[in-house]
Amino acid sequence: HNTTVFQGVEGQSLQVSCPYDSMKHWGRRKAWCRQLGEKGPCQRVVSTHNLWLLSFLRRRNGSTAITDDTLGGTLTITLRNLQPHDAGFYQCQSLHGSEADTLRKVLVEVLADPLDHRDAGDLWVPGESESFEDAHVEH
């Protein structure tokens, strides 16, 4: 898996999307975890509803929320009130038994609030980027 970069502005919300094959991962709950070091474990932040059929319901842990479109095959994670300490490597995961398959590796980058430095009319709202070491999305 290559890494996809998502950039967000400090204090704002950032939405991370993880597409997947909806049939391949049918019936599987999903999770969002934070990578602890390059080779370290991925620490679970939040997972979808315990009942897969209710995966569309938003679940929250602190400022992080997760919801799963199991038909369309898109897992969405929302990080509210983005802070510098939120920056780092994460993974979207598909769960089966105690195993977790990586759906997407993500690098979250937190940018300084542009309103501190420029006129709001020049505001650029960042989102998904493909610039990280020639990163590309693997389906």
Epitope: D21, M23, K24, W26, G27, L51, S98, E99
Partner: antibody, heavy 123, light 107 residues
Framework: EVQLVQSGAEVKKPGESLKISCKGS????????IAWVRQMPGKGLEWMGI????????RYSPSFQGQVTISADKSISTAYLQWSSLKASDTAMYFC????????????????WGQGTLVTVSS | DIQMTQSPSSVSASVGDRVTITCRAS??????LAWYQQKPGKAPKLLIY???SLQNGVPSRFSGSGSGTDFTLTISSLQPEDFATYFC?????????FGQGTKLEIK
Amino acid sequence: EVQLVQSGAEVKKPGESLKISCKGSGYSFTSYWIAWVRQMPGKGLEWMGIIYPGDSDTRYSPSFQGQVTISADKSISTAYLQWSSLKASDTAMYFCARQRTFYYDSSDYFDYWGQGTLVTVSS
Amino acid sequence: DIQMTQSPSSVSASVGDRVTITCRASQGISSWLAWYQQKPGKAPKLLIYAASSLQNGVPSRFSGSGSGTDFTLTISSLQPEDFATYFCQQADSFPRTFGQGTKLEIK
């Protein structure tokens, strides 16, 4: 009706190559993982590995990694198990099985099985 | 790998008897366990999944229970067609592993 139909029994000599097959019908073959399971004479069941025919994603048991190759041809709804150099210890019955995820607990179980292919390796 | 240990390895019983087979995992596997029935020369057949859920078409005399490391398959009233070998299988982690089997014979 869901069916997995395996190729017929094989008798081979040590060192020979072999490819056995498992053809699925009655369901969307590309939407379910297929597992291969070995049963040596009079023994229990051993999980060898799985493949997702939709994209050929494959996982092997460490015990079988490098010993066999699992593949699939989704255009003809068929999964394969192959050996490049058979050994006498490969003599066994080989089953393919459809792996189904039950959403109650988000894990996978084998709900349909092929009839088995008996492989005999003897000089 | 998770080791699955079944007991007894064989059991003799009569039609109408209640039979219990146990399966122990070498580490906790939550409720990620299945039970299969295999008759001579045939493929295994899924009976129970998720430790206690009955597979479609399987008679209600079969039931499963347990979680963590200890699991049980119970046949409430043995029928002639139930004499076979039974295997447990963990679906917790790779590689998937099976118990060594319990052969149910006619007394």
